[in-house]
Interface confidence: low
């Protein structure tokens, strides 16, 4: 196949880190309107598996805030209003990924990182055990 | 608040693009060991408001598979294990980063995007409208 | 289940040509980017060659730029690597890999094909 010239506005990549270094535009492209997931719907209250939304803030990450949900119950809420300790809430995680900077307190130099977060809660039947 | 000194190792950021373009070392900080949410857990079958896993793939995408929740039922799983449509089964959905190869052509240039995937289902209470 | 298998390394002198192959399967090849990646004795791994889906587009590691062509031909499902005027610092085990866009980001890797460059 013949080679394409590369772009002439690439990045330098004779870098002898290249490619284990490689330059992100952070003007996102973002897909989406609604951006903040307490706004975004009322589930974590009308769930049967409430959740309450934590704030993780790390300055020296991107994203520097991270909503994480925590459930408020063991158990899941029935017909009745009460709790259920015949079901369990579970957290349901994400793996996303994130930018760290890398060396601290550099404003455009990052690593990236994949980390685990909680996005909500569910209601799942328990597993039980038998003892014999 | 106090202004931390730069760190004197970091990289030239007298860019004209700066700080829109920042550099990122790509060797990932992995904090978790679990990737595959099929394996993660077995939550998408055990919920009241069950979900399926589908593979959503875009080889020009970092990620280049991501996986997105449907919700089996409009309803959820009651006790005796049938749909109860007096309950909603509804997405959990969450916003994630994922980085795009841009401009073209360039093998170290990218751009950020953000996305909104589903990443499981939970079962709420429905809001009723009543008509006057 | 994927697979990838690797073949055509072995002993050439130094200014020899060697052709490397890979033979892919379980997978869409041709909506993939492909990636040849090397580990030299004692050392860590080696991003070589980027061939885009179609072909049309290669990248290559600074050092092997002008002596190493990459090419496909997907309708065969294959990866090659075209190395000439080798040097004793090619001596490495080459690796055909399936991956992401991000450079060393490979999801699925070849068992390997060892090339030596010694006279």
């Known amino acids: 196949g013949i080679t394409i010239p590369r772009n002439p506005g690439c990045p330098n990549s004779e870098d002898k880190n290249f490619p284990r270094t490689v330059m992100v535009n952070l003007n996102i492209h973002n897909r989406n309107t609604n951006t903040n997931p307490k706004r975004s719907s009322d589930y974590y209250n009308r769930s049967t598996s409430p959740w309450n939304l934590h704030r993780n803030e790390d300055p020296e990450r991107y994203p520097s805030v991270i909503w994480e949900a925590k459930c408020r119950h063991l158990g899941c809420i029935n017909a009745d209003g009460n709790v259920d300790y015949h079901m369990n809430s579970v957290p349901i995680q994400q793996e996303i990924l994130v930018l760290r900077r890398e060396p601290p307190h550099c404003p455009n130099s990052f690593r990236l990182e994949k980390i685990l977060v909680s996005v909500g809660c569910t209601c799942v039947t328990p597993i039980v055990h038998h003892v014999a | 608040g106090i202004t931390i000194p730069r760190n004197p190792g970091c990289p030239n950021s007298e860019d004209k693009n700066f700080p829109r373009t920042v550099m990122v070392n790509l060797n990932i900080h992995n904090r978790n060991t679990n990737t595959n949410p099929k394996r993660s857990s077995d939550y998408y079958n055990r919920s009241t408001s069950p979900w399926n896993l589908h593979r959503n793939e875009d080889p020009e995408r970092y990620p280049s598979v991501i996986w997105e929740a449907k919700c089996r039922h409009l309803g959820c799983i009651n006790a005796d294990g049938n749909v109860d449509y007096h309950m909603n089964s509804v997405p959990i959905q969450q916003e994630i980063l994922v980085l795009r190869r841009e401009p073209p052509h360039c093998p170290n240039s990218f751009r950020l995007e953000k996305i909104l995937v589903s990443v499981g289902c939970t079962c709420v209470t429905p809001i009723v409208h009543h008509v006057a | 289940e994927v697979q990838l298998v690797e073949s055509g390394g072995g002993l050439v002198q130094p200014g020899g040509s060697l052709r490397l192959s890979c033979a892919a399967s379980g997978f869409t090849f041709s909506s993939y980017s492909m990636y040849w990646v090397r580990q030299a004795p004692g050392k860590g791994l080696e991003w070589v060659a980027e061939?885009?889906?179609?072909?049309?587009?290669?990248y290559y590691v600074g050092g092997v730029k002008g002596r190493f062509t990459i090419s496909r031909d997907n309708a065969k499902n294959s990866l090659y690597l075209q190395m000439n005027s080798l040097r004793a610092e090619d001596t490495a085990v080459y690796y055909c890999a399936k991956g992401e866009i991000l450079p060393l980001y490979f999801d699925y890797w070849g068992q390997g094909t060892l090339v030596t460059v010694s006279s």
């Open positions: 061939i885009k889906q179609d072909g049309s587009v290669q």
